[in-house]
C-alpha cells in the first residue's frame, strides 16, 4: 500500500520529502531500484538504479536540484532533498523502491504532497481618489505571494468587513510563478473614511493589513497577524 504524506515549503527554501523504511533496515545499492516521480505528469525527478551513476534521464526541471543520499539509501532512507523550491513544485511526488532480488517486488511506495507558500509583500494602499463627487476609490497592491490570496477590505471604525461587491480584484501570475494582486475598492464618499486592506495567505495562516484614512496620505502602521483563529471568528481576531 502507498503511504501518503504532506509537507510544506517556502519558495526558495530546501525541503525533504520523506520516504524511508523502518530503522534498522539495510539495503544493497546493487539490488534496489528507486524512482522519485511526479504523480500527475510522471516526470522523473531523480532515481537510483544498480550499476548506473548517471542521472541523465532526470527531467531538466529537477536536474541538480533533487538528490537522495547514497549513505541514507544503504539504511533504507530514500528521502528526496529538493533545493530552491518553486511554485511549480507544488504537486504530488511518488517514491517507489523495488528489490531485484525479491523479483522486483515493491519494497516501499510513498506519495508526498508538497504545498508551496510565499509571503505576500506588505500591502500598499493608495491615497483615496475621487472619480466623482460622491465616490471614493482606494487601490490595494501586494506582490510575490503564493498561493492565490484572499483580499478583504475592512471598515476600521468597527472592524467590520466591507461588502465584497464593492471591490474588484485582479490577480496576476508573475514571471516568478508568484501571485501579484491589485484590489480596487469603490465606496460612497463620507466625511471621514477609515478603511483597511487585508491580504490573507490561507496556507501560511497569515494576514497582512494596512489602513488608509481620508485626509491622511500615510497608511496606518502595518500589521501582520499569524495563525488566526478559525474562519468563523476571523474578523474580530484578525482585524482588531
Amino acid at each position: 500500500d502507498t503511504q501518503e504524506k504532506e509537507v510544506r515549503a517556502m519558495v526558495g527554501s530546501d525541503v525533504e520529502l520523506s520516504c524511508a523504511c523502518p530503522e534498522g533496515s539495510r539495503f544493497d545499492l546493487n539490488d534496489v531500484y528507486v524512482y522519485w516521480q511526479t504523480s500527475e505528469s510522471k516526470t522523473v525527478v531523480t532515481y537510483h538504479i544498480p550499476q548506473n551513476s548517471s542521472l541523465e534521464n532526470v527531467d531538466s526541471r529537477y536536474r541538480n536540484r533533487a538528490l537522495m543520499s547514497p549513505a541514507g539509501m544503504l539504511r533504507g532512507d530514500f528521502s528526496l532533498r529538493l533545493f530552491n523550491v518553486t511554485p511549480q513544485d507544488e504537486q504530488k511526488f511518488h517514491c517507489l523502491v523495488l528489490s531485484q532480488s525479491l523479483g522486483f517486488q515493491e519494497v516501499l511506495s510513498v506519495e508526498v504532497t508538497l504545498h508551496v507558500a510565499a509571503n505576500f509583500s506588505v500591502p500598499v494602499v493608495s491615497a483615496p481618489h475621487s472619480p466623482s463627487q460622491d465616490e471614493l476609490t482606494f487601490t490595494c497592491t501586494s506582490i510575490n505571494g503564493y498561493p492565490r490570496p484572499n483580499v478583504y477590505w475592512i471598515n476600521k471604525t468597527d472592524n467590520s468587513l466591507l461588502d465584497q461587491a464593492l471591490q474588484n480584484d485582479t490577480v496576476f501570475l508573475n514571471m516568478r510563478g508568484l501571485y501579484d494582486v491589485v484590489s480596487v475598492l469603490r465606496i460612497a464618499r463620507t466625511p471621514s473614511v477609515n478603511i483597511g486592506c487585508c491580504i490573507e495567505n490561507v496556507l501560511l495562516q497569515q494576514n497582512l493589513t494596512v489602513g488608509s484614512q481620508t485626509g491622511n496620505d500615510i497608511g496606518e502602521r502595518d500589521k501582520i497577524t499569524e495563525n488566526p483563529v478559525s474562519t468563523g471568528e476571523k474578523n474580530a481576531a484578525t482585524w482588531s
Epitope: 502507498t2 524512482y35 510522471k42 538504479i49 534521464n57 517507489l96 531485484q100 522486483f104 511506495s109
Partner: nanobody, 116 residues
Framework: EVQLVESGGGLVQAGGSLRLSCASS????????MGWYRQAPGKVRERVAI???????VYADSVKGRFTISRDNAKNTVYLQMNSLKPEDTAVYYC??????????WGQGTQVTVSS
C-alpha cells in the same frame, strides 16, 4: 509523458507461438524496469514477466519455461516471446514500466486469443 504501444497480439492455436512488442516513446526507457502484464475476462490483472535495466528477468510460475522477456534499449522496445501457448493464456496483454504501474497508468494493450 511516456507512451507505450503494444503490438503482436492475435489469434493462435494451442501449442503455437506469438511475439509481442512494446515500443516506448519516452526518454526514460533505459532506466525503467519493464514488465508484461495480462488480464483475462473477469480476472484481475497479473504480472507475467518483468525485466531490469540490465536484462535480469523474472517470470510468473504459470509461464516459466514457455515465455521469454527481453529488451532492446537502443530501440526503446521490450519483447515477450510466447511459446507453447495454452487457452488459459488468453487475455489482453499490457506492457508497462514498473514505476507507472505504481501510479495506475496503463496503455491499450494487445489481445491474445489461444484456441483449443
Amino acid at each position: 509523458e511516456v507512451q507505450l504501444v503494444e503490438s503482436g497480439g492475435g489469434l493462435v492455436q494451442a501449442g503455437g507461438s506469438l511475439r509481442l512488442s512494446c515500443a516506448s516513446s519516452g526518454s526514460t526507457f533505459s532506466i525503467d524496469v519493464m514488465g508484461w502484464y495480462r488480464q483475462a475476462p473477469g480476472k484481475v490483472r497479473e504480472r507475467v514477466a518483468i525485466i531490469g535495466t540490465g536484462g535480469f528477468p523474472v517470470y510468473a510460475d504459470s509461464v516459466k519455461g514457455r515465455f521469454t522477456i527481453s529488451r532492446d534499449n537502443a530501440k526503446n522496445t521490450v519483447y515477450l516471446q510466447m511459446n507453447s501457448l495454452k487457452p488459459e493464456d488468453t487475455a489482453v496483454y499490457y506492457c508497462n514500466a514498473a514505476r507507472l504501474v505504481a501510479l495506475g497508468s496503463w496503455g491499450q494493450g494487445t489481445q491474445v486469443t489461444v484456441s483449443s
